[in-house]
Structures are given as structure tokens and as C-alpha cells.
């Protein structure tokens, strides 16, 4: 049967993003409509037809445009994505003979990790703190020269949609750690990044 092929996209906050739909059909549609899926009912964003060209709804005027003006292949582009743009979008191809054929493409917004790594001596122990803030939530691991070192992790969600994960490494005999390298590993969207810290006696 006639279907629409789509692909989900993941893009960085405050960058452009494009969503594409392709009607797998011998014939073009009469009109293409893009809608944002909402809890109650979908919200019309933009339409394209031969009769009227591109018609963008006021709420989306400065946010999007149709960048592939096709009635078989249609692409919308967000100029500068925000967290509010995250979600799923429907493309509806109104075809002659077979009515509205729809596809759904979802947009996920990510924020690259911002990482801070520092240490602090206090009396008889050493605390090394690694904090990573990102979207979706990152994971923090430690690579240390020897085993048996304790760590504690705190997760904090921010109103802007990012999450901070802070892990503190508790070293009870700090003298053994001086001059040695500790690695904080941050895992985000399948990529592990190493952040290295050599401990010097202050």
C-alpha cells in the first residue's frame, strides 16, 4: 500500500534542523500539510500546494519554512531549534484517489556536555569532582589507577531541559595519588569523552 517514508532527526540546540517526508507513490499529492503533534489535536504549521504555494501559520512564520517544495518529497527546516521544537511532526500528503496519507518524523534536541573537573584536598582525604551538564542526561564514570576508591553521584535537572550529573571521587590516602592521572569519562549519545586531571600537592 501507499506509504510515507520519514526519518527521525537529532539536532543540537540553537542550530537549524530539517525533517523530510517522501511519498512512495507513482503520483504527487495535491497538497502537503505539516502539523505538530499535540496532546489534544495536531497543530497546523505550513502547507504547500501548486494553487497557493507555501502558506505558513502565524505561530511558525519566523521559525520554519518548506525548503523542499515538492508534492512527493517535502522538507521543513527550523532555522534555530529550541527545546519547544522537540517532538513529533506529521506530514500529510492529500492525494488524488487515496486521500490523506501521513508520516511522522520526530525531532530530538540535544545539548553537548559542558564538563568541569577539579579536586580539593581536605585534611586526610582528597575529593575529585567531575560535573557534566547536557541533554539528554550524560553519564559520568571514573578511571583511576587503583580499585576500591569510593564515589558518589548526584543528578540535578534544570528548568532549561538540561541535566547535571556530578560525581565525586573520595580518596582516603591522597599522598598516593599525587602526580598520578585520574580520568573522568563522560558518556553522551553513545560517545565517551575522557577528561584528565593530574593531582598535584597544593
Amino acid at each position: 500500500q501507499v506509504q510515507v517514508v520519514t526519518q527521525d532527526e537529532r539536532e543540537q540546540l540553537y542550530t537549524p534542523a530539517s525533517l523530510k517526508c517522501s511519498l512512495q507513490n507513482a503520483q504527487e499529492a495535491l497538497i502537503v500539510t505539516w502539523q505538530k503533534k499535540k496532546a489534544v489535536s495536531p497543530e497546523n504549521m505550513v502547507t504547500f500546494s501548486e494553487n497557493h504555494g507555501v502558506v505558513i501559520q502565524p505561530a511558525y512564520k519566523d521559525k520554519i519554512n518548506i525548503t523542499q517544495l515538492g508534492l512527493q518529497n517535502s522538507t521543513i527546516t527550523f532555522w534555530n531549534i529550541t527545546l519547544e521544537d522537540e517532538g513529533c511532526y506529521m506530514c500529510l500528503f492529500n492525494t488524488f484517489g487515496f486521500g490523506k496519507i501521513s508520516g511522522t518524523a520526530c525531532l530530538t534536541v540535544y545539548v553537548q556536555p559542558i564538563v568541569s573537573l577539579h579536586y580539593k584536598f581536605s585534611e586526610d582525604h582528597l575529593n575529585i569532582t567531575c560535573s557534566a551538564t547536557a541533554r539528554p542526561a550524560p553519564m559520568v564514570f571514573w578511571k583511576v589507577p587503583r580499585s576500591g576508591i569510593e564515589n558518589s553521584t548526584v543528578t540535578l535537572s534544570h528548568p532549561n531541559g538540561t541535566t547535571s550529573v556530578t560525581s565525586i571521587l573520595h580518596i582516603k590516602d591522597p599522598k598516593n595519588q599525587v602526580g598520578k592521572e585520574v580520568i573522568c569519562q563522560v558518556l553522551h549519545l553513545g560517545t565517551v569523552t575522557d577528561f584528565k586531571q593530574t593531582v598535584n600537592k597544593g
Epitope: 500500500q1 501507499v2 507513490n25 507513482a26 503520483q27 504527487e28 499529492a29 495535491l30 501548486e50 494553487n51 492525494t95 488524488f96 484517489g97 487515496f98 486521500g99
Partner: antibody, heavy 117, light 107 residues
Framework: QVQLVQSGAEVKKPGASVKVSCKAS????????ILWVRQAPGQRLEWMGH????????NYNLKFKGRVTITRDTSASTAYMELSSLRSEDTAVYYC??????????WGQGTLVTVSS | DIQMTQSPSSLSASVGDRVTITCKAS??????LSWFQQKPGKAPKSLIY???RLVDGVPSRFSGSGSGQDFTLTISSLQPEDFATYYC?????????FGQGTKLEIK
Amino acid sequence: QVQLVQSGAEVKKPGASVKVSCKASGYSFTDYIILWVRQAPGQRLEWMGHIDPYYGSSNYNLKFKGRVTITRDTSASTAYMELSSLRSEDTAVYYCGRSKRDYFDYWGQGTLVTVSS
Amino acid sequence: DIQMTQSPSSLSASVGDRVTITCKASQDINSYLSWFQQKPGKAPKSLIYRANRLVDGVPSRFSGSGSGQDFTLTISSLQPEDFATYYCLQYDEFPYTFGQGTKLEIK
């Protein structure tokens, strides 16, 4: 040149079935929808249904309550319209046509189906 | 189903006359309307699609207008070959439906 040639006239008894063919030539068969309309004597045209030969997807007028089936044979560039459980009011001229989206340009010559006991 | 009502049902006119046939849909059909010409014993011939677009090869004396529920077919100067029956067709919603036809006769 583009042609849609339909099969010849048929006389059928009530309750029987009829299968009308529409052979396309002069163009790529899968690029155009094939549609079927009929016209009973002195009546308006009536859309029966259509098929997209590319996928074989079809759509029917529910008025016919499952009595109509539209198929195609891409290797023979031919579309078929079968109407079952015939009754006297199915006596009509049946036309096939082709369309690219909503652009109708060529039609068959029509096939008269007479339903009579 | 969407009902299509044409008016008038029949019309007498002379060669050279300007003729207007109207078609009213029972609900909004956007611009998804075609006009056909049919002569006795012949297949319909498409004249106009999408309310106002002329089919290739159709003389420019034929024109279509309208959107929503009200549509018009105009023949600016009748020619002898224009005497026929004219049908409108809506294809906004399935099943697609034709008007009852307007028979255009020579006065």
C-alpha cells in the same frame, strides 16, 4: 499514441458477474491511475472506483457494497473492473479513464453491460 | 456523500452566446472540482480541473472559477461543437460524485 481500449459489450443475467477489461498502450501503465465510471441510461455519471497500478492500491465507492473489484495486470498493461451480483439497475455503459493526479486526459470507448433475465 | 447540484438542468443557446453553468457542493470542497463534456454515446471529455485550470487542447473559450461550495463553467462564445451535456465532479472527499448534468441545446 495513448489509447485505452475496453472489452466488448456483455449481456448478463441477474446475479451473475461481469469483468470488463481496459488495455492501455502508448504510455507507462504504472504512471497513471486508472478509474472506472459508469452511466446508466439517462442518468448522471457515477464514480465506481480506481486503482494505482504502481502499487495495486484501489479505492471503491461504498455504494457498491463490495460488489466491485478493480485489479490490474502490469505485464499486460491492463486494468479490470469486475462487478458481481448483477441486477437490472447495473445496466449501463462502463468507462475506464486515466488520470495523473486530478488531470484526466484519456478515456476508453465504453463497454455496454446489459443485465436482463 | 457530497451532493453536487448543477443548474440549470438544461439550457438553450445560440452560436456565439456566452453561457454559464453553475455547480454547488453540499459542503466545502476547496478547489477540487473538474468539469466534463459528454456527447451522446461518447466517453466524457475533461475540460477543467482544480476548478480553474484548463486541460491541454481545450479551447480557451472554456473557463472555470470558484472555490469552496460554488463553481462556474463559462463558455465565452458558443461554437456548434459545444452543444453537449456538461458534468461537474468533486474529488475532495471519497466517493467522488458528479453533478446531475446540464444539457446544452441549440436554440
